[in-house]
Each structure stands twice: as structure tokens, then as C-alpha cells.
């Protein structure tokens, strides 16, 4: 007979996992806010900037109360994957004017990637059903001009900021229900 079975492996406290996810999200939120401000200083541009390929904002702050944990995490993960893809596209196709923000965009991409891994871990810790693999997304067309790249960057950072703000509020609210 083999060695006696060890003590059952205790899953880490999901509240602690959620805490570290909140911290990561909040840090990314502040850095995104700052990077967007930096971009606006470098390239002043009036008005709101939109990009049709970006996800629509998941939820208004007022509707947070009705949220359930699986739905929040699944939707947040899907939206952040889209933003990760857009940041990668921006770094690749954004044009020479955005090269000055390359270190910051690279850091942003790495942190987004880290947050997505953290969400994945949280979902498995909570024994939530894993979402199916993402279908391949259609490629994003390169910006039509240097100014188009800047406007796209402003739209991506603005949308990511709103999504992360929503995420922090949602995660903190859900923590109270665990």
C-alpha cells in the first residue's frame, strides 16, 4: 500500500482571492487613468472618442445591485480580453506617434494579462463553470492615419477606464455576498 493520504488540500479563502483581484484592478484603473491623461496632454483632442470594435460598457453603477458573481466575472473576463487585444493592436499598428507611450502601453498590456490570469484563477477557486474558449475575433483594421491611431488609443483607454471602474465597484459589492 502507498503512503497514507495527506490532509485534504484546503482551497485558499475566496475572499482573499477576491481582495487581491480588487487590488490589481484598482491599480490598473489608476494607471489607465494616468496614461489616458498623459495621452490627452501629448495629443489634445476634443470630444468623445469611440471605436466600434470595443465592448459596450457592462453595467451602469446603478444596476450593480442585481449582479451575480458568475456573470460579473465571465463578463469582466470577456471585456478585458477584448481590451487586451485592442492594446496589442495599438502597440502593433498605432503608428509612430504612439511610440512615445510604448513603455507605458507595454506595462499596461502586461498588467491586463496578469489581471486576466487572476480572474481565471478566481473563477476556478470559486468552482465557477469555465467559459468556452473564445472564438477567433476578426482582425482589427489598422488606423487610417496617425490621428486615427491617437483617437483609437483615447477610445481604448477611456473604455478600459470605465470598465475597470465598474469592475472595482462590482467586485467590492460581490465580496460582501461571499
Amino acid at each position: 500500500p502507498g503512503p497514507p493520504p495527506g490532509p485534504p488540500r484546503v482551497s485558499p479563502d475566496p475572499r482573499a482571492e477576491l481582495d487581491s483581484t480588487v487590488l490589481l484592478t484598482r491599480s490598473l484603473l489608476a494607471d489607465t487613468r494616468q496614461l489616458a491623461a498623459q495621452l490627452r496632454d501629448k495629443f489634445p483632442a476634443d470630444g468623445d472618442h469611440n471605436l466600434d470594435s470595443l465592448p459596450t460598457l457592462a453595467m451602469s453603477a446603478g444596476a450593480l445591485g442585481a449582479l451575480q458573481l458568475p456573470g460579473v466575472l465571465t463578463r469582466l473576463r470577456a471585456d478585458l480580453l477584448s481590451y487586451l487585444r485592442h492594446v496589442q493592436w495599438l502597440r502593433r499598428a498605432g503608428g509612430s506617434s504612439l511610440k512615445t507611450l510604448e513603455p507605458e502601453l507595454g506595462t499596461l498590456q502586461a498588467r491586463l494579462d496578469r489581471l486576466l490570469r487572476r480572474l481565471q484563477l478566481l473563477m476556478s477557486r470559486l468552482a465557477l463553470p469555465q467559459p468556452p474558449p473564445d472564438p477567433p475575433a476578426p482582425p482589427l483594421a489598422p488606423p487610417s492615419s496617425a490621428w486615427g491611431g491617437i483617437r483609437a488609443a483615447l477610445a481604448i483607454l477611456g473604455g478600459l477606464h470605465l470598465t475597470l471602474d465598474w469592475a472595482v465597484r462590482g467586485l467590492l459589492l460581490l465580496k460582501t455576498r461571499l
Partner: antibody, heavy 120, light 108 residues
Framework: EVQLVESGGGLVQPGGSLRLSCAAS????????MHWVRQAPGKGLEWVAY????????YYADTVKGRFTISRDNAKNSLYLQMNSLRAEDTAVYYC?????????????WGQGTLVTVSS | EIVLTQSPATLSLSPGERATLSCSVS???????LHWYQQKPGQAPRLLIY???NLASGIPARFSGSGSGTDFTLTISSLEPEDFAVYYC?????????FGQGTKLEIK
């Protein structure tokens, strides 16, 4: 040596206006975000407003939103706070402050402050 | 808005003693966004510690900071007469940026 010198404070009636200035020297003013922070007599510190180096992003505390306007003139190394519709509760010493080297490192340099008194 | 609550409101100690000041944050914040300031009567505040544990320029090594999440601490290992002042914590992760109400460190 970094220096920040506020001016423009004084006595003003409720509903009145005042414009504070902050003259900066000893650093590249156009490279740093700047803040206004105030302190009512005998009370704690209250953040008022922030402006990025290029003036394209501005944040305000809810207590002053719509009444105060922060601005800067990088050519003159100056920061401003235009205060309108002043209330008794705006009475405070107003400090201008510079962020450290990065936005997330706190308010590293402060002026000596200028006193604003709102009273009839 | 993120609320910072400092305790105790007043701390009475003697020179040479160790001082421990607390700052409790209403919501989880990353430690790199928590800073400490010292203010003496009639003077502007002075940055002591930034990003929870980094000493600002010119600050003596008897000052140290620690903490994470919602609980942060400023420690003065051995009080000097010039350390008696008001101390404020501040968060910079969320707009509006907010300060604690202050802890007054007075001579016993």
C-alpha cells in the same frame, strides 16, 4: 531648489471671487502635475483640484466643482485657482503642491500657503 | 469616495519612545498609493513616506511605514523633540484624493 509661492489670498464676502496664484521655480514646471490643497483653521487637509502638465485633464473635489477653476501657464511657471461663488466654508489656507516624480508618489513639494477668509 | 480614518486622534508620548500611528482605509487600496505627511504648527505639510514604505528625500531613518489592503501604519522608532506634530495619511488611487483627519503626536 524647488520653490512654490502662493499669493492672492485675502478677505472676501460670501458670493465673491478670488484668484490665487502659485509661482514655481527650481524645476521644469511643464513636466509635473500640480494640485491645490486647503486647510480650514484648526482642521485637517482637504484636496481641492489637480491639473496635468499639459492642462488637458483636470479633477476637482465635489465641494468645489462648478465654482473653482484650476489652470496653469507653463510659459510663466504659474498655477492658478479661480474661486467663484465663495462660501464661508471655503475659508482656509490654500496650498499649491507638486507631485513627486510620478503621479502615485504623493505631494512632495508644498508652498507656504495663502489664507482665504470668506466673511461678511 | 475613499475614507481614511486615523487612530488615535491624539497620542501622548515622551522623547525616546516608539510611536505607532494607524490609518484605516474604507476600501482596499494598493499599497503604492498610500502616503504619509507631517505638519507642524504654522507650517506647510511635508511628505514623509510615499508608497506605504518609501522614505521621502531628507527624512530620517527612524520613520518607517508598512501595511497593505486597508490597514497602514507609520512608526517612529525613537521620538525626537522635533517629531511632535500632526501626521496625515493620504490615498492617491482614486479621485477625489483624500486625507485622514490626522493624528496629533504630543509630548507627554
Amino acid at each position: 531648489e524647488v520653490q512654490l509661492v502662493e499669493s492672492g489670498g485675502g478677505l472676501v464676502q460670501p458670493g465673491g471671487s478670488l484668484r490665487l496664484s502659485c509661482a514655481a521655480s527650481g524645476f521644469t514646471f511643464s513636466s509635473f502635475g500640480m494640485h491645490w490643497v486647503r486647510q480650514a483653521p484648526g482642521k485637517g487637509l482637504e484636496w481641492v483640484a489637480y491639473i496635468t502638465p499639459g492642462s488637458n485633464t483636470i479633477y476637482y473635489a465635489d465641494t468645489v466643482k462648478g465654482r473653482f477653476t484650476i489652470s496653469r501657464d507653463n510659459a510663466k511657471n504659474s498655477l492658478y485657482l479661480q474661486m467663484n461663488s465663495l462660501r464661508a466654508e471655503d475659508t482656509a489656507v490654500y496650498y499649491c503642491a507638486r507631485e513627486y516624480y510620478s503621479y502615485d508618489e504623493g505631494f512632495a513639494y508644498w508652498g507656504q500657503g495663502t489664507l482665504v477668509t470668506v466673511s461678511s | 469616495e475613499i475614507v481614511l480614518t486615523q487612530s488615535p486622534a491624539t497620542l501622548s508620548l515622551s522623547p525616546g519612545e516608539r510611536a505607532t500611528l494607524s490609518c484605516s482605509v474604507s476600501s482596499l487600496i494598493p499599497s503604492k498609493y498610500l502616503h504619509w505627511y507631517q505638519q507642524k504648527p504654522g507650517q506647510a505639510p511635508r511628505l514623509l513616506i510615499y508608497r506605504t514604505s518609501n522614505l521621502a528625500s531628507g527624512i530620517p531613518a527612524r520613520f518607517s511605514g508598512s501595511g497593505s489592503g486597508t490597514d497602514f501604519t507609520l512608526t517612529i522608532s525613537s521620538l525626537e523633540p522635533e517629531d511632535f506634530a500632526v501626521y496625515y495619511c493620504q490615498q492617491g488611487v482614486d479621485v477625489p484624493f483624500t486625507f485622514g483627519q490626522g493624528t496629533k503626536l504630543e509630548i507627554k
